[in-house]
């Protein structure tokens, strides 16, 4: 499934702190003494930014003063900074901050592209740890649903510590985590199989870390296009990590000529970038919310996070709409290959397969599509939603919309097309996934505007859980079994094997036409929902005591 | 009690073919797979071919020394394997031994757990 | 291809006596190498799988050990029934391999 499994995982996050600047502006001087030390003295949830010899530096998630030594430096509110340097001091905003949000961007980017490098790193050699280890197919299944269930599982769990605790602490351990995974994982002996089923369980449980936090700290740097364009370039690092997790793969096992070597690139270059994390991305708070201290926390369950983003409308859609983007990329990555294999021998420009991998060469053809059209699917959702933003305020989900509609007309014609022309069904394949993915980082900007900031990490996990469960957990299964019960049916020919496998895919376009319909649902209640949230942000930001969440 | 009996072997000319044929019971033999072996006379142990379960696609792996000239399949609703032998020559003069691999549902070893008494092959002219 | 080499080639020992096989391979297989006996005119038997795992009705005076590329295969106090030929195969990659064998007899 290259490229595309857990997309809408990440999909979905990057979004906490963003409104924060914009935010802090209004806000500058408003409150100089309203619950001064209350405010003064409320914890940080990360350590803040770098503080330069003499003068406050403003951070993305507050001030920070430069303390006489011997006293600790306290993370405040721009209200509490205020309140120290009087009413009408002016914050300097030095040069490098700009720089500083830029590298801690790119080095999350580049954290995320790992991630799939090393997802893929594994699917691309797949075939060599099957032929190791002896795995049927339905062992390598095994492999895919432990990985997808403990992925879906430990969102929720790092949702819940991403909206609490340090950020990038968490994300950091995260790479750590499952770049010692990976690494173990090259040592195991043929005969544990069970324990290669349990690293891909705790890379899952690693990489959920990461998914779900790191796009709510891109949220916190930018804004507006500019979030957008940084979200973009976030979820670049989804084709791109896919790709060169293949070509890792290969080439590594060539080059060495064991595979288990393949498995041990990744890791390092995880353990560099964990280390980066850790030194470059700032602690980033979330939005006002944090700067009220501990308080709001305090408030605020997880039950409450629950029942309130059960009842944002836009959120539940767009994860729905999520959810069948998931099923889709899901099932066509799993079966699209083969399918163009046995049209193939339908067409008889192919034999019959006996000896596996069958459709190779269209494995490598779909991948490099699949990749491809990520980038340019990413682009073309961020250029149009930034374009149609000139025109409507409900541009991004209705840019979702016509995407996922468009991408569904395309992908019924792939089943037209792959009767009498393979070219004519990648093209096909080409336009439809290119509008398909085109809503990756638009859903998440989605779920910023219409998501608290303390609330995004849940936000982020609950939508990359429901988008599993719903979508790629189940839906390559749906798919073959649906397949399967067509062909009793009907006689065994390559024919029908060719038919029946059509017939079921015809299923992936009806769930995108319902993604796109959840989308235009989306679309009616994004404003209401955007402007019940910076309301909500508004009474966040007010004195402590009339705080109601 | 596991058993495999191999039968089909024979004396046969140089370039000529033949078909052994492995008849197996006390195993669950559909989700097992299969191998041959040879072992040429006061020599050693040689593996020919194994062939895998359907839930592996029936994917078949040679030795290089055979690949091309031998063919190995499976018939699970007779519970049968086979290694049909094209363009055999005089090395291939050997005892064949039909062996199973130890089966853990999502995996199979690649170690041989039972094997059959032999059947033996002369190329000779 | 990995190549097996076993030593010696040939074994003369009392009824007794414990002896050491040795199996080396080519390059570093982790734990994937069996150990068969094989009884004249007899077909092969698997006696330990993955370089010390004891196989069920196997005595248990056999016993395996080794990783990487060295792997030993011990029979505590030889009996009269254990003369005969023992392989080694590794399973760590394909082509399936067996070393030439290590024939046991009595001294």
């Known amino acids: 499934m290259m490229c595309l499994e857990c997309a809408s995982a990440a999909a979905g996050g990057a979004e906490e702190e963003e409104a924060d600047a914009e935010r802090r502006r209004r806000r500058r001087g408003a409150q100089p003494g309203a619950g001064g030390s209350a405010c003064c003295g409320a914890r940080g949830v990360g350590g803040a930014g770098v503080v330069s010899a003499d003068e406050e530096v403003q951070t993305l998630s507050g001030s920070v003063r430069r303390v006489p030594s011997g006293l600790p430096s306290i993370p405040s509110t721009p209200g509490c900074a205020a309140a120290a340097k009087g009413p009408s001091a002016p914050q300097p905003k030095p040069a490098s901050l700009g720089r500083g949000r830029g590298a801690a961007a790119a080095i999350l980017s580049l954290g995320n592209v790992l991630n799939y490098l090393d997802r893929y790193t594994v699917a691309g050699v797949l075939l060599d740890i099957q032929q190791h280890f002896g795995v049927k197919d339905r062992g390598a299944g095994l492999l895919q649903s432990v990985f997808i269930c403990s992925f879906m599982v430990a969102a929720p769990i790092f949702g819940y510590l991403g909206d609490r605790f340090n950020r990038k602490v968490i994300l950091s351990c995260g790479i750590f985590f499952w770049s010692a995974v990976t690494f173990s994982s090259s040592f195991i002996p043929q005969q544990y199989f069970w324990l290669l089923v349990l690293s891909r369980g705790l890379v899952g449980i690693g990489e959920a870390s990461y998914s779900t936090i790191a796009p709510t700290i891109i949220g916190d740097l930018f804004t507006k296009n500019t979030r957008t364009l940084m979200l973009s370039v976030f979820y670049f690092a989804i084709p791109l990590g896919s790709g060169l997790g293949y070509i890792t793969g290969s080439s590594v096992k060539q080059a060495a000529g064991d595979w288990h070597w393949a498995l041990r690139v990744s890791p390092v270059l995880g353990m560099i970038t964990g280390t980066l994390i850790l030194i470059l991305v700032p602690a980033t708070k979330r939005g006002h919310a944090d700067q009220l201290g501990g308080q709001l926390k305090a408030r605020t369950s997880w039950l409450r996070d629950m029942k309130a983003l059960i009842r944002n409308r836009s959120y539940v859609f767009s994860s729905l709409a999520t959810s069948a983007v998931s099923f889709a990329t899901g099932a066509l990555g799993m079966w699209i290959p083969l399918y163009l294999h046995r049209a193939q021998v339908v067409q008889k420009t192919a034999e019959t397969c006996n000896s596996p991998p069958c459709g190779a060469k269209d494995s490598l053809i779909f991948g490099a599509i699949t990749c491809f059209t990520g980038f340019l699917g990413v682009v073309t959702g961020a250029g149009a939603t930034r374009w149609c933003r000139l025109r409507t305020q409900r541009a991004d989900p209705l840019v979702c919309a016509v995407g996922m509609l468009g991408s569904a007309i395309f992908i019924c014609l792939i089943f037209v097309a792959a009767k009498t022309s393979i070219v004519g069904a990648y093209i096909c394949i080409f336009v439809g996934e290119t509008l398909l993915f085109s809503n990756w980082a638009i859903t998440a900007d989605i779920l910023m505007y219409v998501v608290i900031p303390t609330r995004r990490a849940t936000a982020v996990a609950l939508q990359s859980f429901t988008s599993h469960l719903l979508g790629d957990a189940g839906s390559p299964y749906l798919i073959g079994f649906i397949s399967d019960l067509i062909r009793q049916s009907t006689k065994d020919s390559p024919l029908w094997e060719f038919l029946s496998l059509g017939y079921a895919l015809m299923l992936c376009p009806f769930v995108v036409v319902l993604g796109g319909m959840f989308f235009l649902a989306t679309a009616l209640f994004f404003l209401s929902d955007r402007a019940k949230a910076e309301q909500q942000v508004n009474q966040l930001v007010m004195p402590p005591a009339s705080v109601k969440v | 009690e596991v058993q495999l009996v191999e039968t089909g072997g024979g004396l046969v000319q140089p370039g000529s073919s033949l078909k052994l044929s492995c008849a197996t019971s006390g195993f669950t033999f559909s989700d097992t797979w299969m191998s041959w072996v040879r072992q040429a006379p006061g020599k050693g142990l040689e593996w020919v071919a194994l062939?895998?379960?359907?839930?592996?696609?029936?994917?078949?792996n040679y030795a290089e020394s055979v690949k091309g000239r031998f063919t190995i399949s499976r018939d699970d609703s007779k519970r049968r394997v086979y290694l049909q032998m094209f363009t055999l020559r005089d090395q291939d003069t050997a005892t064949y031994y039909c062996?199973?691999?130890?089966?853990?549902?999502?995996?199979?070893?690649?170690?041989?757990?039972?094997w059959g008494h032999g059947v033996m092959v002369t190329v000779s002219s | 291809d990995i190549v097996l080499t076993q030593s010696p080639a040939t074994l003369s020992v009392t009824p007794g006596e414990s002896v050491s096989l040795s199996c080396r391979a080519s390059q570093g297989i982790s734990t994937s190498i069996h150990w068969y006996q094989q009884k004249s005119n007899g077909s092969p038997r698997l006696l330990i799988k993955?370089?010390?795992q004891s196989i069920s009705g196997i005595p248990s005076r056999f016993s395996g050990s080794g990783s990487g590329t060295d792997f030993t295969l011990r029979i505590n106090r030889v009996e009269s029934e254990d003369f005969s030929v023992y392989y080694c195969q590794q399973t760590y990659s394909l082509p399936l391999t067996f070393g030439s064998g290590t024939r046991l007899e009595i001294k």
């Open positions: 062939i895998k379960d359907k839930n592996s696609n029936y994917e078949a």
């Open positions: 062996t199973s691999h130890e089966d853990f549902y999502y995996y199979s070893s690649y170690y041989f757990d039972y």
């Open positions: 993955y370089a010390s």
